[in-house]
């Protein structure tokens, strides 16, 4: 049994780091493998992660962490029984993938303005709370070409757009994702999408 693709890990910078790797053949990850992880700190305790299958030869492990600070560094040991298959290290602050925003809501009752709001996925005491910026994706269910991205570079988790920038009388969907420039993170996953029917009064044309 050998590791074909070494583990790569990302942290949500809160409580979970996710590591993925590939074996050289079909593997029952949960029965055959264990990923041990340990904070590099005097007298820190080793923890065991039981991996799950992620495709035939792929494995994924969700490492539970108390919290994360920039100084943290973890050692990682991948074991198959008594055999050490791979040894490495992981600094969560250097591999951050933020949590996805939640509770995306479209408010359509504000005159002819659409107000999209969502929740910051971090609690106020987490470093990322005040460092997230967002991308909002809006698309038409009827017209695949009607697809747009709005970059929200301010901290408030909301976006206002004129309803008239979208077509009237058809259904749209929206979703949002986050990233943090301070840690050069990857983008989060997209939030679940939300759907609404776009309708607004066309301005009365005078001739």
């Amino acid at each position: 049994m050998k590791v074909l693709q070494e583990p790569t890990c990302v942290s949500d910078y809160m409580s979970i780091s996710t590591c993925e790797w590939k074996m050289n053949g079909p593997t029952n990850c949960s029965t055959e493998l264990r990923l041990l992880y340990q904070l590099v700190f005097l007298l820190s305790e080793a923890h065991t992660c039981i991996p799950e299958n992620n495709g035939g030869a792929g494995c994924v492990c969700h490492l539970l962490m108390d919290d994360v600070v920039s100084a943290d560094n973890y050692t990682l040991d991948l074991w198959a029984g008594q055999q050490l298959l791979w040894k490495g290290s992981f600094k969560p602050s250097e591999h951050v993938k933020p949590r996805a925003p939640g509770n995306l809501t479209v408010h359509t009752n504000v005159s002819d303005t659409l107000l999209l709001t969502w929740s910051n996925p971090y609690p106020p005491d987490n470093y990322l709370y005040n460092h997230l910026t967002y991308a909002v994706n809006i698309w038409s269910e009827n017209d695949p070409a009607d697809f747009r991205i709005y970059n929200v570079t301010y901290l408030e988790p909301s976006l206002r757009i004129a309803a008239s920038t979208l077509k009237s009388g058809i259904s749209y969907r929206a979703r949002v994702r986050a990233w943090a420039q301070c840690y050069n993170t990857t983008w989060s996953e997209w939030s679940p999408s939300t759907k609404w029917h776009n309708s607004y009064r066309e301005p009365f044309e005078q001739h």
Partner: antibody
């Protein structure tokens, strides 16, 4: 919210024994090492000893001043750490704190007072 | 055992002052130094570890620095709630050892 509550302190004669308890809540107790630290009145902090988690085979470490007299144990099912103190001396008189160890001693109990006097 | 020598033993300062406390280890402890604050009749609280990393909830006016054997805790602008005793500790090796403490008093 992480909470540590010590109990079991009191007055004991030199040569006597006492067992302190530290009840933990608000975190997964079994995953953390636990320390005991003491402080004589008006003095500084003195590390007493430490017990590691099951993943480290419940290894224990002690300060030279208490070695062979004090024993640290834990019961993960009760979320409790213990400090068994035997052959107590007057110089063991202090407030005893239990602390969680993660990145240093990140949470402390309120302390329990042990007085060794005849 | 590694000895941690803290200075000064005590100091008097006013609100708004910049305060510096030093700790010298008897050998290189590779930035494995923590700082604790203790108020009268209360348990100590962790403020800094790894020499410079603030613990959750610790105000930014507290900063730690140092390397090798010499470490410093700085309070950039002393506030009324900062009057307390501060202890350094090495977390480089067992036995864990503390400095003797520095009492910060109101001038």
């Amino acid at each position: 919210e992480v909470q540590l509550v010590e109990s079991g302190g009191g007055l004991v004669q030199p040569g006597g024994s006492l067992k302190l308890s530290c009840a933990a809540s608000g975190f997964t107790f079994s995953m953390y090492g636990m320390h005991w630290v003491r402080q004589a009145s008006g003095k500084g902090l003195e590390w007493v000893g430490h017990i590691r988690s099951k993943s480290s085979n419940y290894a224990t470490y002690y300060a030279d001043s208490v070695k062979d007299r004090f024993t640290i144990s834990r019961d993960d099912s009760k979320n409790t750490a213990y400090l068994q103190m035997n052959s107590l001396k007057t110089e063991d008189t202090a407030v005893y704190y239990c602390t969680r160890w993660f990145r240093a001693m990140d949470y402390w109990g309120q302390g329990t007072t042990v007085t060794v006097s005849s | 055992a590694i000895r941690m020598t803290q200075s000064p033993f005590s100091l008097s300062a006013s609100v708004g002052d910049r305060v510096t406390i030093t700790c010298k280890a008897s050998q290189d402890v590779s930035t494995a130094v923590a700082w604790y604050q203790q108020k009268p009749a209360k348990a100590p609280k962790l403020f800094i570890y790894w020499a410079s990393t603030r613990h959750t909830g610790v105000p930014s006016r507290f900063s730690g620095s140092g390397s090798g054997t010499d470490y410093t805790l700085t309070i950039s602008s002393l506030q009324p709630e900062d009057f307390a005793t501060y202890y350094c500790q090495q977390h480089y090796s067992t036995p864990l050892t503390f400095g003797g403490g520095t009492k910060v008093e109101i001038k």
